[in-house]
């Protein structure tokens, strides 16, 4: 069976939107009005992995681009990157480990934990216009909570 996907946007707990910053980076900033059209639309695919009631494995691609968020070690540190893939082969049910995130729902908020690096989360800074990154702390200064807005295909 083909992998199930949906289109969505994400905003962090401070209501910052995610936009492209150069070809291989996302940044978070507050957008209003027509500027909201700049925000990236994700293609969230429901992939193979360990699943529970509040934890669902997903891959996060950028709609209409052959780019996926992935988590790799760079200089011995878990790092979030945008990785290009062959569009003929993605998305797929069995994604490589680095592409998989555990979507965790708590109190109507979403967290995205790296499946490859447990306890590391997609994060944004309090400051405006800063890169989206993989952070190793929850409940600190950096933001790990998001809300999801469905986008019609």
């Amino acid at each position: 069976a083909p992998v199930r996907s949906l289109h969505c946007t994400l905003r962090d707990a401070q209501l910052k939107s995610l936009v492209m910053s150069g070809p291989y980076e996302l940044k978070a900033l507050h957008l209003q009005g027509q500027d909201l059209e700049q925000q990236v639309v994700f293609s969230m695919s429901f992939v193979q992995g360990e699943e529970s009631n509040d934890k669902i494995p997903v891959a996060l691609g950028l709609k209409a681009k052959n780019l996926y968020l992935s988590c790799v070690l760079k200089d011995d540190k878990p790092t979030l990157q945008l990785e290009s893939v062959d569009p003929k082969n993605y998305p797929k049910k069995k994604m490589e480990k680095r592409f998989v995130f555990n979507k965790i729902e708590i109190n109507n908020k979403l967290e995205f934990e790296s499946a490859q690096f447990p306890n590391w989360y997609i994060s944004t800074s309090q400051a405006e216009n800063m890169p989206v990154f993989l952070g190793g702390t929850r409940g600190g200064q950096d933001i790990t909570d998001f809300t999801m807005q469905f986008v019609s295909s």
């Epitope: 193979q48 790799v72 070690l73 990785e83 062959d86 490589e96 480990k97 680095r98 490859q116 690096f117």
Partner: antibody, heavy 120, light 107 residues
Framework: EVQLVESGGGSVQPGGSLRLSCAFS??????????VGWIRQAPGKGLEWVSH???????SYNPSLKGRFTISKDTSRNTVYLQMNSLRAEDTASYFC????????????WGQGTTVTVSS | DIQMTQSPSTLSASVGDRVTITCRAS??????LSWYQQKPGKAPKLLIY???KLHSGVPSRFSGSGSGAEFTLTISSLQPEDFATYFC?????????FGQGTKLEIK
């Protein structure tokens, strides 16, 4: 010091089954990011990746095997298994287990290999 | 599947020579490439990972370079113990695939 030791190889007729074991020491397969893979080498040929298992139980297989092999682990025994069913002559090879950490993979430590011969 | 093609299949060289082995991928594999050395009857040994990072304990005469779909392993000055077969491995996409190998033999 990391060590991996394969066992369970031998001769079997086409259609038969074998279970290979990879006993390891010097690392734990409950450590996040850790993985063990099976790689085989037919006589005089190159290397072919067969299967892989991560610390969290996530498994991957080479689709060329068409579902005949199953990988599993016993974390408490520090052992990874490869159950091979419906064996064919083309499965004749040395089977190595090897350790990696994280994806993308590179295999840091290898066992010495165990030989599987499928012949009537 | 991603096909990995190594060239040459066999390479004859002498001690002290500088040699280069090439690995080509059938599509872009980023820098997700590793190199292994194997001697007859032995298990492979990791030399290089992430295209250019030298595995601990590997002599500095070994180096790796490349990106995208073309990669090279270079041995700057061949030593007697370097005569072996060399394999590349791509880790970009499952199934992970090896090159067919390059046998480095004494001229």
């Amino acid at each position: 010091e990391v060590q991996l030791v394969e066992s369970g190889g031998g001769s079997v007729q086409p259609g038969g089954s074998l279970r290979l074991s990879c006993a390891f020491s010097g690392f734990s397969l409950s450590t996040s990011g850790m993985g063990v893979g099976w790689i085989r080498q037919a006589p005089g040929k190159g290397l072919e990746w067969v299967s892989h298992i991560w610390w969290d139980g996530d498994e991957s297989y080479n689709p060329s095997l068409k579902g005949r092999f199953t990988i599993s682990k016993d974390t408490s025994r520090n052992t990874v298994y490869l159950q091979m069913n419906s064996l064919r002559a083309e499965d004749t090879a040395s089977y190595f287990c090897a350790r990696n950490r994280y994806d993308p993979p590179w295999f840091v430590d290898w066992g010495q290999g165990t030989t599987v011969t499928v012949s009537s | 599947d991603i096909q990995m093609t190594q060239s040459p299949s066999t390479l004859s060289a002498s001690v002290g020579d500088r040699v280069t082995i090439t690995c080509r991928a059938s599509q872009d594999i980023s820098n997700y490439l590793s190199w292994y050395q194997q001697k007859p009857g032995k298990a492979p040994k990791l030399l290089i990972y992430y295209t250019s990072k030298l595995h601990s304990g590997v002599p500095s005469r070994f180096s790796g370079s490349g990106s995208g779909a073309e990669f090279t392993l270079t041995i700057s000055s061949l030593q007697p113990e370097d005569f072996a077969t060399y394999f590349c491995l791509q880790g970009k996409m499952l199934p992970w695939t090896f090159g067919q190998g390059t046998k480095l033999e004494i001229k």
